[in-house]
């Protein structure tokens, strides 16, 4: 049930009052206000928006609202020397050039400071050479090319389609394969849903539309020049050669009209199978190089972007808790956008704004939450989660001692089909209970709960009658809180039907066409899905900040730990002979999971029975719940990824967006059959099992009776 324990004496200030105050019309109005001009990180426009949000949050009634600034490495195209790709003939003449900017959407033709499509943090360079088509540039795509097809990418320019995995992983893979440049493009197979018109007549990607994005491999480091520490006024900055995660080869994104011109001439090997074919009318030949008539033509990249240390601004708002002001529940989402940010991030920022307004309304009427709520408008998320990470680095000691939960609030929608939630298992029951109390906005589910429509449309693959909740990966601002600091985290948004829409993300992601009109005309005209997301995010924050006992259920962690142990064991058992040869045993891990399950069960029983009127015992039990997530942190971090410290979850080494369970063991086992020294490789597997078993056991013991 929703908690009723407002710290003010008037009982009307409960969850219902907070939820009833949230209005779709306000979210719509805020979205419009936030999307009329670009708000690129590091620009004056985004600084002005930060000051506007600061002012409005103060008006809404927060106790304090401060700007927190940092000087971080950003990347911009050269205004007088544009980036483009050419097809050149044998004389070096450019016979085709890719577009310099996207055709502007109707009504935005005269808007200045629209950054042209570029791959942020690409080094400068003008490589020329033969093209190799590498599908999605995933690890398995390069395995197929190099191992099965014997195609060498060394010294080649590779062209990869966007989708399936984070673009930074594509670039890393291309670098490791020896490529000297990368062209990223959006294939209609992934970014054009059948039966829908392209923008401005529908929500599909036009041929001239291009996805921007950073191509870093930061692994949680934050600002590339100040890993581990805030980029403040007295920061010591690394030289650019020592910067974390920067790509070493030029990279540039294009749309499918331009991709057609490059791909239609491709020769060499045919695609290995149908999974390598997109929807363009081209052969999808792998190359290398162009076919017969065009074999003397080459591709040349012209990249002139620059990396610059630039000031960014977070907005941090505080609503002080009445009973436990030293316990922080954080709601954060970013403010910076690539262009207008119609979906990413402003559909999320508008929801946060309305949540702040609702909390502020209650506070003006005399209510306060039990715990402190921090609201954050992060800067430079698009450049590598920089604003959130720098702030967390600056405040890490406070956060690790006081951080109860972090709720992320980027894009509220990526579709309008059903709810999507990724969170720590500690929040499963909170999410289930909350969604049972909320009305579904879906057609055909009038009068039904959100839980019901969500479960029907997105059922759990393991538990019947329950909805799917996914693992946290990365690619958003929860990363530092969850993966580095071990603060219980969650995110929620409305999503598409993954069954029928196989494209990656939403078609207009990070393009100039991500406008207010895109949302208002095609995704959510009534803003009912935005309102639902506001209720979910806001409701989670309310409950986390206001319930007497923290709404965490440690038994759900026990369930998933067993599932993850079974999964990693079955992966390892694909090598039964080696397991025998090298005496690899998972007994310690299964034993630790069993212990965790038993201790969690006993803890939950005590949680039902203890005297909640005793503030010391209450605080003790809540601290055990709060610190459980923290107990999964290994201070040494994962191998070669020191800022990914969570032993149970990390972003996949092959796709930053995806979460991997028992990542240390998983990475040690990955492609182990190809390792040159099997003894050493299986030794690392054993070490990772040891680390995981120890961590699970240690976490279990934090739930034991204290004395």
């Amino acid at each position: 049930k929703s908690s009723n324990e407002a710290t003010n004496i008037t009982p009307k200030h409960n969850m219902k009052a907070f939820l009833d105050e949230l209005k779709a019309e306000n979210i719509k109005k805020f979205l419009y206000n936030f999307t009329q001009i670009p708000h690129l990180a590091g620009t004056e426009q985004n600084f002005q928006l930060a000051k506007q949000i600061q002012s409005q949050w103060k008006e809404f009634g927060l106790d304090s609202v401060e700007l927190a600034h940092y000087d971080v490495l950003l990347s911009y195209p050269n205004k007088t020397h544009p980036n483009y790709i050419s097809i050149i003939n044998e004389d070096g003449n450019e016979i085709f050039n890719t577009s310099l900017f996207e055709p502007p959407p109707p009504g935005y033709e005269n808007v200045s400071d629209i950054v042209p499509p570029f791959s942020a943090f690409s080094p400068q360079g003008m490589p020329e050479g033969d093209l190799v088509y590498v599908n999605y540039a995933r690890t398995e795509d390069f395995f197929k090319l190099e191992r099965d097809m014997k195609i060498n990418c060394s010294g080649k320019i590779v062209i990869a389609r966007y989708g399936k995995v984070f673009r930074g992983n594509k670039v890393k893979n291309a670098q490791l394969a020896g490529a000297k440049g990368v062209i990223l493009y959006s294939d209609p197979a992934d970014y054009f849903a059948p039966g829908v018109k392209s923008y401005p007549d529908g929500w599909n990607l036009p041929g001239g539309g291009v996805q921007r994005g950073n191509i870093l491999n930061l692994n949680g480091a934050g600002d590339p020049l100040t890993p581990g520490y805030p980029a403040n006024e007295y920061a010591y900055r690394r030289g650019i050669a020592e910067a974390v995660g920067l790509p070493s080869i030029p990279v540039h994104p294009i749309g499918y009209y331009d991709a057609q011109k490059l791909l239609e001439k491709m020769g060499g090997s045919a695609p290995p199978d149908s999974s390598w074919r997109g929807s363009l009318k081209v052969p999808y030949n792998v190359g290398p190089g162009f076919t017969g008539n065009f074999s003397t033509q080459k591709v040349k990249m012209h990249i002139h972007s620059t990396n610059e240390v630039t000031r960014i601004y977070n907005v941090i708002g505080t609503l002080r808790g009445a009973v436990e002001p030293d316990r922080y529940v954080i709601l954060g989402g970013h403010r910076d956008s690539w262009v207008f940010g119609g979906i990413d991030p402003q559909s999320g920022a508008a929801v946060v704004h309305e949540i702040v307004r609702s909390f502020g309304t209650l506070k003006k009427e005399g209510w306060r939450p039990r715990r402190t709520i921090l609201f954050a408008s992060w800067d430079a998320e698009e450049f590598g989660l920089l604003g959130s990470t720098e702030w967390a680095e600056e405040n890490s000691r406070l956060l690790q001692e006081r951080g109860v939960a972090y709720i992320n609030a980027d894009s509220s929608i990526e579709g309008n089909y059903t709810l999507r939630v990724d969170c720590t298992p500690l929040m499963y029951s909170l999410v289930h209970n909350l969604t049972k109390e909320l009305k579904s906005p879906d057609e055909g589910f009038e009068g039904k709960s959100l839980y019901e429509s969500w479960t029907k449309k997105s059922p759990s693959p393991e538990f019947s009658g329950m909805p799917r909740i996914s693992k946290l990966g990365s690619g958003n601002d929860f990363e530092v809180f969850f993966q580095r600091l071990g603060i219980a985290s969650g995110r929620a948004r409305y999503t598409k039907n993954w069954e029928t829409n196989k494209f990656s993300g939403y078609p207009l992601y990070h393009s100039v066409y991500e406008t207010y009109e895109l949302v208002e005309k095609f995704y959510d005209p009534m803003f009912k899905y935005h309102l639902t997301v506001a209720q979910v995010r806001g409701g989670m924050v309310f409950e986390l900040a206001n319930s007497i006992v923290l709404p965490f259920d440690c038994r759900d962690y026990a369930v998933v730990l067993r599932k993850y142990a079974d999964k990693i064991y079955s992966i390892s058992m694909k090598h039964p002979q080696e397991m025998k040869t090298y005496s690899v045993s998972f007994d310690s891990l299964f034993s630790a999971v069993k212990n965790f399950t038993e201790i969690a069960s006993k803890f939950s029983e005590r949680l039902q029975d203890f005297d909640k009127s005793n503030p010391i015992v209450l605080r003790m039990m809540n601290d055990q719940l709060m610190f459980l997530e923290r107990a999964f942190i290994d201070p040494l971090g994962l191998p070669d990824r020191p800022f990914y410290r969570h032993v149970i979850y990390a972003p996949s080494s092959h796709n930053k967006y995806a979460g991997e369970s028992f990542p240390g063991i998983y990475d040690a086992l990955f492609d182990i059959e190809s390792k040159v020294d099997p003894s050493k490789a299986w030794g690392e597997v054993k070490r990772q099992i040891y680390v995981a078993a120890f961590t699970v056991q240690a976490a279990a013991e934090t739930l034991s009776e204290v004395a």
Partner: antibody, heavy 125, light 112 residues
Framework: QVQLVESGGGVVQPGRSLRLSCAAS????????MHWVRQAPGKGLEWVAV????????YYADSVKGRFTISRDNSKNTLYLQMNSLRAEDTAVYYC??????????????????WGQGTTVTVSS | DIVMTQTPLSLSVTPGQPASISCKSS???????????LYWYLQKPGQPPQLLIY???NRFSGVPDRFSGSGSGTDFTLKISRVEAEDVGLYYC?????????FGGGTKVEIK
């Protein structure tokens, strides 16, 4: 309404230069490719050059390649044709014309829909 | 370059009677995306050309329905179902499947 107005024509000696302008109004100039087409006295139509909406691609008829340069200033809604090393055979009425379909909808060079009234270039000694 | 050949060179038509102009291209004008890039223009005396038909058979906005286009591949036809006095002028076909864009030599239509 959609309008294209050419200017800059005149009488010029062979070997000299001339710059034609085409002022566009009544439509979103930045979203359209643009052509130059000419018509010699008493003759048919001859395509001269095309430029993409963003200026990234420019293509020319062989007869003018290396001598003529097509360009555009999207902030001024203006198309240009810089004509150098002019010859007698360049004498014609020069029309600017809009590509039929905006860049939001198609990538190849469509034909022309709207044409200007033309400006006359006479190359004579 | 693609050569566009128009016939006849000229046409004298009684008002209210039909007229037909043929245009043949030296290569197919069918693009891999299914579009056929053949256009018809009319240039009235002392005026710039005006678009009548695009992609073989689509009438441009404001063009009377007495004008129609047909054909495929390399053979195309412009028909005027009932010629009117205002239809006099030079008719050109044009291809844009590849650069350089090329025009037919023109067909002069006059009223008897």
């Amino acid at each position: 309404q959609v309008q294209l107005v050419e200017s800059g024509g005149g009488v010029v000696q062979p070997g000299r230069s001339l710059r034609l302008s085409c002022a566009a109004s009544g439509f979103t100039f930045i979203s359209y490719g643009m052509h130059w087409v000419r018509q010699a006295p008493g003759k048919g139509l001859e395509w001269v050059a095309v430029i993409s909406y963003d200026g990234s691609n420019k293509y020319y008829a062989d007869s003018v390649k290396g001598r003529f340069t097509i360009s555009r200033d999207n902030s001024k809604n203006t198309l240009y044709l810089q004509m150098n090393s002019l010859r007698a055979e360049d004498t014609a009425v020069y029309y600017c014309a809009r590509v039929l379909v905006g860049a939001l909808y198609y990538y190849n060079y469509y034909g022309m829909d709207v044409w200007g009234q033309g400006t006359t270039v006479t190359v004579s000694s | 370059d693609i050569v566009m050949t128009q016939t006849p060179l000229s046409l004298s038509v009684t008002p209210g009677q039909p007229a037909s102009i043929s245009c043949k291209s030296s290569q197919s004008l069918l693009h891999s995306d299914g579009k056929t890039f053949l256009y018809w223009y009319l240039q009235k005396p002392g005026q710039p050309p005006q678009l009548l038909i695009y992609e073989v058979s689509n009438r441009f906005s404001g063009v009377p329905d007495r004008f129609s286009g047909s054909g495929s591949g390399t053979d195309f036809t412009l028909k005027i179902s009932r010629v009117e006095a205002e239809d006099v002028g030079l008719y050109y076909c044009m291809q844009s499947i590849q650069l350089p864009l090329t025009f037919g030599g023109g067909t002069k239509v006059e009223i008897k």
